[in-house]
């Protein structure tokens, strides 16, 4: 169950999709990717306060145990719930080819 | 690709499966779960240094961008890669029932 979407920490502070612009050099891809030369990387960033966008039962347990034992059990973490595919034009041993990556860009986020 | 399983921070410091013992009270389940009265919760805890157990391309990107922009992009996070099911004996409006939860106990871990 995706729990509450209301962020008690204030607007934009909780787990959500962010876009970070990155060059091929930033990503360490310059030696094997030809295009795009810049990627709009969508990623999940933000806090996961109690029951905010809890992905599943495990996330709810983690929230409860983190409250009890904060030094032992970390709070849930903001990670992708699903991905958008992206195509890269890349160099290979046999020449230039296209490759679609299904797990490159975050589509939406949850806490786990 | 699950990248390196060698932890550069020392034994047991990186993302791995831990077991945390929790009572129904700890979990906030005392009013609806009858059994078990204590749960051995398996969860994913630990650091995710560069490329350690990187779940996918997104995790690799996150590592690269965290290195470049640590204040903006968080490091990858240690989360379940899969789950073990668990059955609970629970109270319902119509009496006692069994319910299997597929997303309660972490089975193994990766960084994302």
């Amino acid at each position: 169950a995706r729990n509450g979407d209301h962020c008690p920490l204030g607007p934009g502070r909780c787990c959500r999709l962010h876009t970070v612009r990155a060059s091929l050099e930033d990503l360490g891809w310059a030696d094997w990717v030809l295009s795009p030369r810049e990627v709009q990387v969508t990623m999940c960033i933000g806090a996961c306060p109690s029951q905010f966008r809890a992905a599943n039962m495990h996330a709810q347990i983690k929230t409860s145990l983190h409250r009890l034992k904060p030094d032992t059990v970390p709070a849930p973490c903001c990670v992708p719930a699903s991905y958008n595919p992206m195509v890269l034009i890349q160099k290979t041993d046999t020449g230039v080819s296209l490759q679609t990556y299904d797990d490159l860009l975050a589509k939406d986020c949850h806490c786990i | 690709a699950r990248n390196g399983d060698h932890c550069p921070l020392g034994p047991g410091r990186c993302c791995r499966l831990h077991t945390v013992r929790a009572s129904l009270e700890d979990l906030g389940w005392a009013d609806w779960v009858l059994s078990p009265r204590e749960v051995q919760v398996t969860m994913c805890i630990g650091a995710c240094p560069s490329q350690f157990r990187a779940a996918n391309m997104h995790a690799q990107i996150k590592t690269s961008l965290h290195r470049l922009k640590p204040d903006t992009v968080p490091a990858p996070c240690c989360v379940p890669a899969s789950y073990n099911p668990m059955v609970l004996i629970q109270k319902t409006d119509t009496g006692v029932s069994l319910q299997t939860y597929d997303d309660l106990l972490a089975k193994d871990c990766h960084c994302i």
Epitope: S35, V87, L105 | -
Partner: antibody
Framework: QVTLKESGPGILQPSQTLSLTCSFS??????????VSWIRQPSGKGLEWLAL???????RYNPSLKSRLTISKDASSNQVFLKITSVDTADTATYYC??????????WGQGTLVTVSA | EIVLTQSPALMAASPGEKVTITCSVS???????LHWYQQKSETSPKPWIY???NLASGVPVRFSGSGSGTSYSLTISSMEAEDAATYYC?????????FGAGTKLELK
């Protein structure tokens, strides 16, 4: 395996509207970076780029024809469409549909011959 | 718009001969935005060289590309019969996307 197939009326008369369909398989137009272009080639002549549509519905047109061109897509049914209004004999050509990821004409359809004749 | 001028328009080469086709661009572009395509008669064009010098998958290694700014070239180190075709340069630096008029390479 990527395939693209163009379909059109074959023959039409001056002043009519040309409607072309590109049906493709082996890739998705919902994939970030993916695009589909239309290019035409009159018999024995060179290549002329007409229009391009990307995954995010960004559309680009050749300004010399822009007022007559409309490109659209139905990503769910793997189809891209091109309409050219007010055709005349100069629009007689083979029309190609091309998979266009980012900045490359990567896979070309076999082409469909369109003849404008009175 | 960016104009691409290819030369020669038509040429013939013997098997084993070195062949160079040039593409002159009307304004300077990044080498990553200059591509080449091969077209044989009655067939669709095929991508041949991406970003000035990167051979498309399956293109024989006797082909190479080079250049920068406004001057680019495609070279065949040793002509073979299957290389007879028309070659087009194309820029993806700015819209409208444009092609050269083509160089028709025949086997002598």
């Amino acid at each position: 395996q990527v395939t693209l197939k163009e379909s059109g009326p074959g023959i039409l008369q001056p002043s009519q509207t040309l409607s072309l369909t590109c049906s493709f398989s082996g890739f998705s137009l919902s994939t970030s970076g993916m695009g589909v272009s239309w290019i035409r080639q009159p018999s024995g002549k060179g290549l002329e780029w007409l229009a391009l549509i990307y995954w995010d519905d960004d559309k680009r047109y050749n300004p010399s024809l822009k007022s007559r061109l409309t490109i659209s897509k139905d990503a769910s049914s793997n189809q891209v469409f091109l309409k050219i209004t007010s055709v005349d004999t100069a629009d007689t050509a083979t029309y190609y549909c091309i998979q266009s990821p980012w900045d490359w004409f990567a896979y070309w359809g076999q082409g469909t011959l369109v003849t404008v004749s009175a | 718009e960016i104009v691409l001028t290819q030369s020669p328009a038509l040429m013939a080469a013997s098997p084993g001969e070195k062949v160079t086709i040039t593409c002159s661009v009307s304004s300077s572009i990044s080498s990553s935005n200059l591509h080449w395509y091969q077209q044989k008669s009655e067939t669709s064009p095929k991508p041949w060289i991406y970003g000035t010098s990167n051979l498309a998958s399956g293109v024989p290694v006797r082909f190479s590309g080079s250049g920068s700014g406004t001057s680019y070239s495609l070279t065949i180190s040793s002509m073979e019969a299957e290389d007879a075709a028309t070659y087009y340069c194309q820029q993806w630096s700015s819209y409208p996307l444009t092609f050269g008029a083509g160089t028709k390479l025949e086997l002598k």
